[in-house]
Amino acid sequence: KAMHVAQPAVVLASSRGIASFVCEYASPGKATEVRVTVLRQADSQVTEVCAATYMMGNELTFLDDSICTGTSSGNQVNLTIQGLRAMDTGLYICKVELMYPPPYYLGIGNGTQIYVIDPEPCPDSD
């Protein structure tokens, strides 16, 4: 079953290569277990950035080596991606699945264009 997912159109990463955005889904029921996946689309290639599952009201659990962190509040997921560089500029798509209880719902956002600008190196001071 399909579900609507909303996310901002554009986000600018900080000078430290950190970008945050909210992914909001219109839950048709009372989900207790949710899976969130962030995918990057660039040059028609789609790659998985990170994925997490969480029980409603609890923290998101990403893999240890994940570049993502996040928190949840109701039907909103606050996602933060770290370690971004200019080459990581692209469309970051939020995918939400309501895993339990049945029925299973799937929603895919339109994507957030994240722009990353590498900071200029500090000039040497004599």
Partner: nanobody
Framework: EVQLVESGGGVVQAGGSLRLSCAAS????????MGWFRQAPGKEQEFVAD????????YYADSVKGRFTISRDNAKNTVYLQMNSLKPEDTAVYYC????????????WGQGTQVTVQS
């Protein structure tokens, strides 16, 4: 045209095992993910398990965790569901599904295979 064909369903006694297979045919492709869903009569469709190509990462519904194992053979474009310690409540039609890319949703579905667990 991609086709998913399930096999391996049947009737089994509670506590028994079955191994479902789902073979993809119709072309050369690399799926982002493949998974299993089930639907019992008069009930909503339920997610069972899936596996993502990227890291071979697996995910299971709590109701089957520790009893079912999903695996895939990329060379054969086949996904398997090993079901152990079956319970009567596992009785359902099991459907295989495949995602071509992570942002396409479940693009392809099999026709389903019936699993009946007798007590």
């Amino acid at each position: 045209e991609v086709q998913l064909v399930e096999s391996g369903g049947g009737v089994v006694q509670a506590g028994g095992s079955l191994r479902l297979s789902c073979a993809a045919s119709g072309g050369t492709f690399s799926f982002y993910g493949m998974g299993w869903f089930r639907q019992a009569p008069g009930k909503e469709q339920e997610f069972v398990a899936d596996i993502r190509t990227s890291a071979g990462r697996t995910y299971y519904a709590d109701s089957v965790k520790g009893r079912f194992t999903i695996s895939r053979d990329n060379a054969k474009n086949t996904v398997y569901l090993q079901m152990n310690s079956l319970k009567p409540e596992d009785t359902a039609v099991y459907y295989c599904a495949a995602e071509m890319s992570g942002i396409s949703g479940w693009d392809y579905w099999g026709q389903g295979t019936q699993v009946t667990v007798q007590s």
